[in-house]
């Protein structure tokens, strides 16, 4: 931004500048250019020997300026366009200035003035241009400063040129008030802080409803000596509930929200939320819908899922395979997991209780992501009820549960009762029994044994009878032995695991049961 302190052309001849000597040399004249009257100070004493004609401006108040720019528009006639070349003719003039705290009026003293420069034209007006009224306008600019007094004068010294001053404009530069990155920077005088620091650092203030981002830098700009803003640093962002519209922050419209200070616009309230008011930072969930703590505010509100679909329990001897399908209503979420709980009831007494401790699951029964699980080690003659609950990220926000149950009765054989009949250093003779009523259902018995402490290998023997001798064993070694009935339906209940020890080579005949 240029702040004009003096503009001769704009004053349309109303500025009465001082000429010295009075009535000679410089002269205010009017001409017509482009059908418009223009005023100029001119002098053309090119055949009268040495000249020293001065033209001094009126006193110019400095205002806040430290450095001023002087723009001159002028025309100079070619000395060769005059007869005989006008021997004393010159084609330059001199520019001076003087600072003062008061206006000296008509008191003009050359010695008070300091020369700024000799002003020479880039283009002179030759005869043909003069006759055709082609004004060869030259533009020259000079900078003066730093200025310290209240005001100043400019002066033009003619030394024998044919020159016309059409425009004298004196101005200083300001970096204009500016909005940048939602920060307001004040109008700033363009000054060099020092020769090594030609930029003035100016702090901006965030516009209404804008803030400096957390951990970010406040807005800064640099004002150059040329009155231009450079190198923005930092920024302001519209605060929560407001979005950037041109150079301002505007409240989010009803039905929209913005949860944090950011560059992003307000977002439409997601599904299953209540319509927000103006300037909302979030949108409340509809009744029955919820947001998990980790859910972004831009996500739709969701609800717990419905119960799993089509739960089936398929009995396979002492095992049950549970299968189900995903809930019809996921609640709008993908993070569904399943939990399986088990209850067993004794048919004789009708007594029931949890059975988590006595059964084995093919994978941990809580936070299942698959839709099937196998439960083994079920006891015979027992009624089991399995509940499969579907849960998602918002299930913990409600007390109700979404589950489906399936019951199954275990009719498989009781576990065989096993005992050690005999033993030696290399063999163990094992016998077992089951109730007579169940014997018809047994197809074979499966005896599994291994050295205690050796989890990597085991041996299996099948037999139709109620006893087996396990040979080729190591002396003085404890073996883990389990007997399980095999029925048409699959595996029956297994006996508990027994520990039997072979005799040592010098050992006694004591037996461990």
């Amino acid at each position: 931004k240029e702040v004009v302190l003096l503009d001769f052309a704009a004053m349309k001849g109303e500025l009465g500048w001082l000429t010295h000597p009075y009535g000679k040399g410089w002269d205010l004249m009017q001409n017509i250019m482009d059908d418009m009257p223009i005023y100029m100070y001119s002098v053309c004493n090119v055949v009268s020997g040495d000249q020293d004609n001065w033209l001094r401006t009126n006193w110019v108040y400095r205002e806040e300026a430290e450095r001023i720019f002087i723009e001159l528009k002028f025309t100079v006639r070619d000395c060769n366009s005059f007869p005989g070349g006008a021997s004393s003719c010159k084609e330059t003039f001199n520019l001076y200035y003087a600072e003062s705290d008061v206006d000296y009026g008509t008191n003009f003293q050359k010695r008070q003035f300091t020369k700024i420069d000799t002003i020479a034209p880039d283009e002179i007006t030759v005869s043909s241009d003069f006759e055709a009224r082609n004004v060869k306008l030259n533009v020259e600019e000079r900078m003066v400063g730093p200025l310290t007094r209240k005001g100043f004068y400019l002066a033009f010294q003619d030394i024998g040129a044919c020159v016309a001053l059409l425009s004298v404009r004196v101005y200083y530069k300001k970096c204009p008030e500016m909005l940048q990155s939602l920060a307001r920077f004040p109008e700033t005088i363009a000054v060099a802080v020092s020769d090594t620091q030609p930029l003035a650092t100016v702090a901006g203030t965030c516009v209404d409803h804008a803030v400096v981002p957390y951990g970010g830098e406040g807005p800064l700009m640099h004002c150059t000596v040329d009155g231009e803003w450079l190198v923005p640093i930092g920024q302001c962002l519209c605060q929560e509930g407001y979005e950037k519209v041109e150079d301002a922050c505007r409240a989010c419209s009803p039905g929209f929200f913005k949860s944090e200070a950011s560059e992003s616009p307000c977002l439409e309230c997601p599904e299953h939320t209540l319509p927000s008011t103006e300037g909302a930072t979030s949108c409340q969930c509809e009744e029955g819908y919820f947001r998990a703590p980790e859910d972004p505010l831009s996500m739709s509100c969701t609800r717990p899922p419905s119960a799993p679909n089509y739960l089936t329990a398929i009995g396979m001897g002492a095992k049950v395979e549970l299968r189900w399908t995903a809930p019809k209503d996921t609640g709008g979420r993908q993070d569904i997991v399943y939990s399986v709980t088990c209850e067993q009831c004794w048919p004789e007494s009708g007594e029931c209780g949890p059975c988590e401790a006595s059964v084995r699951y093919s994978e941990p029964p809580h936070a299942l992501t698959r839709t099937s699980v196998t439960v083994s080690d079920l006891e015979p003659h027992m009624n089991y009820t399995f509940a499969v609950e579907a849960r998602n990220g918002v299930s913990g926000l409600v007390t109700s549960r979404s589950f489906r149950t399936a019951s199954v009765s275990i009719n498989q054989t009781e576990p065989p009762k096993v005992r050690l009949e005999d033993r030696s250093t290399t063999s163990l003779s094992v016998t077992w029994s089951i109730p007579v009523s169940q014997q018809s259902r047994v197809w074979k018995y499966e005896v599994t044994y291994r050295k205690k402490g050796d989890a990597n290998s085991y041996n299996v023997r099948r037999t139709e009878g109620f006893s087996v001798t396990l040979d080729d064993l190591a002396p003085d070694t404890t073996y883990l032995v389990q007997v399980q009935a095999l029925t048409q339906e699959g595996q029956g209940a297994g006996s508990k695991v027994h520990e039997f020890q072979t005799l040592s080579t010098e050992g006694s005949a004591n037996m461990a049961v």
Epitope: M29, T75, S81, E131, C162
Partner: antibody
Framework: EVQLLESGGGLVQPGGSLRLSCAAS????????MAWVRQAPGKGLEWVSR????????HYADSVKGRFTISRDNSKNTLYLQMNSLRAEDTAVYYC?????????????????????WGQGTLVTVSS | DIQMTQSPSTLSASVGDRVTITCRAS??????LAWYQQKPGKAPKLLIY???NLHTGVPSRFSGSGSGTEFTLTISSLQPDDFATYYC?????????FGQGTKVEIK
């Protein structure tokens, strides 16, 4: 020394035509703006027409516009005024006048010109 | 067109007198004004241009002043050769109009 010598004047009937000539010497004719100025008997001066150093532009007074034509031949150092449809009010002494910008000690040319050099004039009489 | 009005139309003076002739323009012509001298049966002669600039070879007793609409031609000390008719001419517009003339005669 600058010399301008007009010729071609005389008596002519209204509606008739006449061609005036102005022979120039003692200066560089092609540098000069040239003009015709007339003076009716016992009256003041009236500018008639002008022509630029190279033959253009040309200007005319409203009273002669469309009837008179100014021209020049720089190779012959001669200025002309072709006068058609002459009227009684055109009766006057016609002066050839010249202007050289080199003698105009001003920084910017005036909107028009004045006349530095004059011929002795030639009389044109329009009468029936 | 710009009208130029001279006053007086006739002026009687004696040798050695200071003589002033006035020329008024119907609108501002800045300083674009010339003064001419004409003797009977002769061509006009240029005296002054741009209101105050003396033409080459013109005696310094002649001077011109003024700007805008009011102009004067001054003969500081009238000489026998100066008895003639004087015309002003504006060249601020293409019409280049002359004043009606001021006749300076012997008193």
């Amino acid at each position: 020394e600058v010399q301008l010598l007009e010729s071609g004047g005389g008596l002519v009937q209204p509606g008739g035509s006449l061609r005036l000539s102005c022979a120039a010497s003692g200066f560089t004719f092609s540098h000069y703006m040239m003009a015709w100025v007339r003076q009716a008997p016992g009256k003041g001066l009236e500018w008639v027409s002008r022509i630029g150093p190279s033959g253009g532009p040309t200007h005319y007074a409203d009273s002669v516009k469309g009837r008179f034509t100014i021209s020049r031949d720089n190779s012959k150092n001669t200025l002309y005024l072709q006068m058609n449809s002459l009227r009684a009010e055109d009766t006057a002494v016609y002066y050839c006048a010249g202007y050289d910008s080199g003698y105009d000690y001003v920084a910017v040319a005036g909107p028009a010109e004045y006349f530095q050099h004059w011929g002795q004039g030639t009389l044109v009489t329009v009468s029936s | 067109d710009i009208q130029m009005t001279q006053s007086p139309s006739t002026l009687s003076a004696s040798v050695g007198d200071r003589v002033t002739i006035t020329c008024r323009a119907s609108q501002s012509i800045s300083t674009w004004l010339a003064w001419y001298q004409q003797k009977p049966g002769k061509a006009p002669k240029l005296l002054i241009y741009k209101a105050s600039n003396l033409h080459t070879g013109v005696p310094s007793r002649f001077s011109g002043s003024g700007s805008g609409t009011e102009f004067t031609l001054t003969i500081s000390s009238l000489q026998p050769d100066d008895f003639a008719t004087y015309y002003c001419q504006q060249y601020n517009s293409y019409s280049r109009t002359f004043g009606q003339g001021t006749k300076v005669e012997i008193k």
